[in-house]
């Protein structure tokens, strides 16, 4: 039957790893509920949507953000929530749907003509509005890359890693986000053990480069948990 085929091909909906580290079981995420099946001539809906646990926006779909489902709810319980449309309230860019960003607590259109000059202003303004802005400003698909005529060089203000040139990622620096170098083999990296701990970083490191993963440095295995040093190592 169709259902058994779907179930056998489904990516298992497992809870995400702490900190959302790549390379651990999680679930890739999916298309809109309406799906065109091969051989069919109409859309059939699979109602398999369920609240998806997350630790950061990047674990959610491009039309979602990661937050506590209730106002003032348990900070430790976060799920992927639907993004907010234009003129809805927001506390950071990631809350706004693609094509919009958060300005003065409201989702507004990412107008090509005036957006660039407002990035820094918006980041600074929103930082003062609510502590949750520390959870990141990136809206994955808010702004098409063509809004930037050139990719950001090291130190350039950015919203997401695709705004940066190859070999750089978009990472937090104080209350802004700038393009920083992707980590090389042997460089110290950050492995988040506590859910949501990424939000506490004022100086965020990039992820490890292609072919590398963030692992405990071999000679630090005996050290206490709190002092373990992680470095980028070959798979």
């Amino acid at each position: 039957t169709l259902n058994s085929v779907l179930n056998s091909n489904a990516i298992k909906n497992l809870p995400p790893p702490l900190g959302g580290a790549a390379g651990h079981p999680g679930s890739a995420v999916s298309a809109a509920p309406g799906i065109l099946y091969p051989g069919g001539n109409k859309y059939q809906t699979i109602d398999n949507y369920q609240p998806y646990p997350c630790a950061e926006d990047e674990e959610c779909g491009t039309d979602e953000y990661c937050a506590s489902p209730t106002r003032g709810g348990d900070a430790g319980v976060q799920i992927c929530l639907a993004c907010r449309k234009r003129r809805k309230r927001c506390m950071r860019h990631a809350m706004c749907c693609p094509g919009n960003y958060c300005k003065n607590g409201i989702c507004v259109s990412s107008d090509q003509n005036h957006f660039r000059g407002e990035i820094e202003e918006t980041i600074t303004e929103s930082f003062g509005n609510d502590h949750s802005t520390l959870d990141g400003y990136s809206r994955r698909t808010t702004l098409s890359s063509k809004m930037y005529h050139t990719k950001g060089q090291e130190g350039s203000v950015c919203l997401r890693s695709s705004d940066c040139a190859s070999g750089l990622c978009c990472a937090r620096h104080f209350w802004s986000k700038i393009c920083k170098p992707v980590l090389k083999e042997g460089q110290v990296c950050t492995k988040h053990r506590r859910k949501g701990s990424h939000g506490l970083e004022i100086f965020q490191r990039c992820y490890c480069g292609e072919g590398l993963s963030c692992r405990i440095q071999k000679d630090h295995h005996q050290a206490s948990n709190s002092s373990r040093l992680h470095t980028c190592q070959r798979h």
């Epitope: 779907l6 091909n9 990516i11 995420v29 799906i35 398999n48 990047e58 779909g61 491009t62």
Partner: nanobody
Framework: EVQLVESGGGLVQAGDSLRLSCTAS????????VGWFRQAPGKEREFVTA????????DYADSVKGRFTISRDNAKNTAYLQMNSLKPEDTAVYYC??????????????????WGQGTQVTVSS
Amino acid sequence: EVQLVESGGGLVQAGDSLRLSCTASGSAFSSSVVGWFRQAPGKEREFVTAINWSGARTDYADSVKGRFTISRDNAKNTAYLQMNSLKPEDTAVYYCAAGSDRYARVLTEYEYVWWGQGTQVTVSS
């Protein structure tokens, strides 16, 4: 529209490593989930691994966990499959696929709307 091209396949010995690349043309790649599937002669196509738009989420079939690693570089419009400790049973045509990544929920094979032509991986004992 996204066109996908796989490369990096070949003939290797059991225990060796191989890295497959999936290069995409089309701006939708960076907001797509990317998956690798494989099909051995006379068998059905099976899921191998997948990675979400940002690389923050990955998933692996039990048969490849700990041996295969999926990664992506959105700046280069490319996804990678690093295959270590290869076994003869890994012999198959490997396909790269991509689909919309709008919502965090289960993704079925049918929702991968773009597929590559495949690259042959042969592992001899």
